[in-house]
Interface confidence: low
């Protein structure tokens, strides 16, 4: 079964992505994912979660970083980098900017 | 240093549509961590908030001015315009462009130097 | 959405310290700590002087201070200099989509 949407307190997190409505959001706690999809950079964006904790707890891998943490704005200036593959030049930054 | 540089027609008719364009220099629009808006302020008066939107187009407006405003981006070419509708001799002002910066400041860091439009026939 | 409350004037003596208040709602200066003040001189853009309430970027001189109380915001100018004369808006976050600026505060330096 899907988590249940949390129904602690709310926290304010920075809220950058397609899919923001303003500057910050708010919700059971704040997150950064990174993700690298096939042939392109690594898009970082930053939000509120509510459902689906236990990705927090997921190990980074070359294709997807997700962070989350618990405090006000936590995730605001917060910068991700993907597990390096098995070429270290390879490896992708960040790009949170 | 990134710059903001406002351009567009300085005078126009009442019930036509206001057209304005902001060009980023200097850094990219589609940096994710900025939200560009445009801010108003009639002659004598103080300064209105009229819109902002985010490099992927999600837009959000003034409520008193939404039925009339629409704001887009075009990261091809670092820009992001302004569009009015119906004007009339209210809507004279001038008006900035501006980046919200919500990495490091929390507040429109860069303004444009203002370009003043003025709705008259 | 309505503007944030601001005094028309302010005035003091070169040397002397100013506050001007910026009074809202708990939907936009009591709910957010995004406040901000601007300075604008006549014909020239506005330049930001404090973000996130309390916070001078680089450049700004320390004389320049915020503070919040509740749902009030305050800009002080200490040791006014005849250069600080100038309107001062401020502005906040209010929501989800939504930005509100104040009306705006005439500073003179007597």
């Known amino acids: 079964d899907p988590v249940k949407p949390s129904r602690g307190p709310l926290v304010t997190c920075t809220c950058e992505s397609p899919h923001c409505r303003g500057p910050t959001c708010q919700g059971a706690w704040c997150t950064v994912v990174l993700v690298r999809e096939e042939g392109r950079h690594p898009q970082e964006h930053r939000g509120c979660g509510n459902l689906h904790r236990e990705l927090c707890r997921g190990r980074p891998t070359e294709f997807v970083n997700h962070y989350c943490c618990d405090s006000h704005l936590c995730n605001r200036n917060v910068s991700l980098v993907l597990e390096a593959t098995q070429t270290p030049s390879e490896q992708p930054g960040t790009d949170s900017q | 240093q990134l710059q903001l540089q406002e351009s567009g027609p300085g005078l126009v008719k009442p019930s036509e549509t206001l057209s304005l364009t902001c060009t980023v220099s200097?850094?990219?629009?589609?940096?994710?961590?900025?939200?560009w808006g445009w801010i108003r302020q009639p002659p004598g008066k103080g300064l209105e908030w009229i819109g902002n939107?985010?490099?992927?187009?999600?837009?959000f407006y003034n409520p008193s001015l939404k039925s009339r405003v629409t704001i887009s981006v075009d990261t091809s070419k670092n820009q992001f315009s302004l569009k009015l509708s119906s004007v009339t001799a209210a809507d004279t002002a001038v008006y900035y462009c501006?980046?919200?910066?919500?990495?490091?400041?929390?507040?429109?860091?860069?303004w444009g130097q203002g370009t003043m439009v003025t709705v008259s026939s | 959405q309505s503007a944030l409350t601001q005094p028309p004037s302010a005035s003091g003596s070169p040397g002397q310290s100013v506050t001007i208040s910026c009074t809202g709602t708990?939907?936009?200066?009591?709910?957010?700590?995004?406040v901000s003040w601007y300075q604008q001189h006549p014909g020239k853009a506005p330049k930001l002087m404090i973000y996130e309430v309390s916070k001078r970027p680089s450049g700004v001189p320390d004389r320049f201070s915020g503070s919040k109380s509740g749902n009030t915001a305050s800009l002080t100018v200490s040791g006014l200099q005849a250069e600080d004369e100038a309107d001062y808006y401020c502005t906040s976050f209010a929501g989800s989509n939504n930005w509100v600026f104040g009306g705006g505060t005439k500073l003179t330096v007597l």
């Open positions: 200097g850094g990219s629009i589609s940096s994710r961590s900025y939200y």
């Open positions: 939107i985010y490099y992927s187009g999600s837009a």
């Open positions: 708990s939907s936009d200066v009591g709910g957010y700590n995004y």
């Open positions: 501006a980046r919200w910066d919500n990495w490091d400041v929390g507040a429109f860091d860069i």
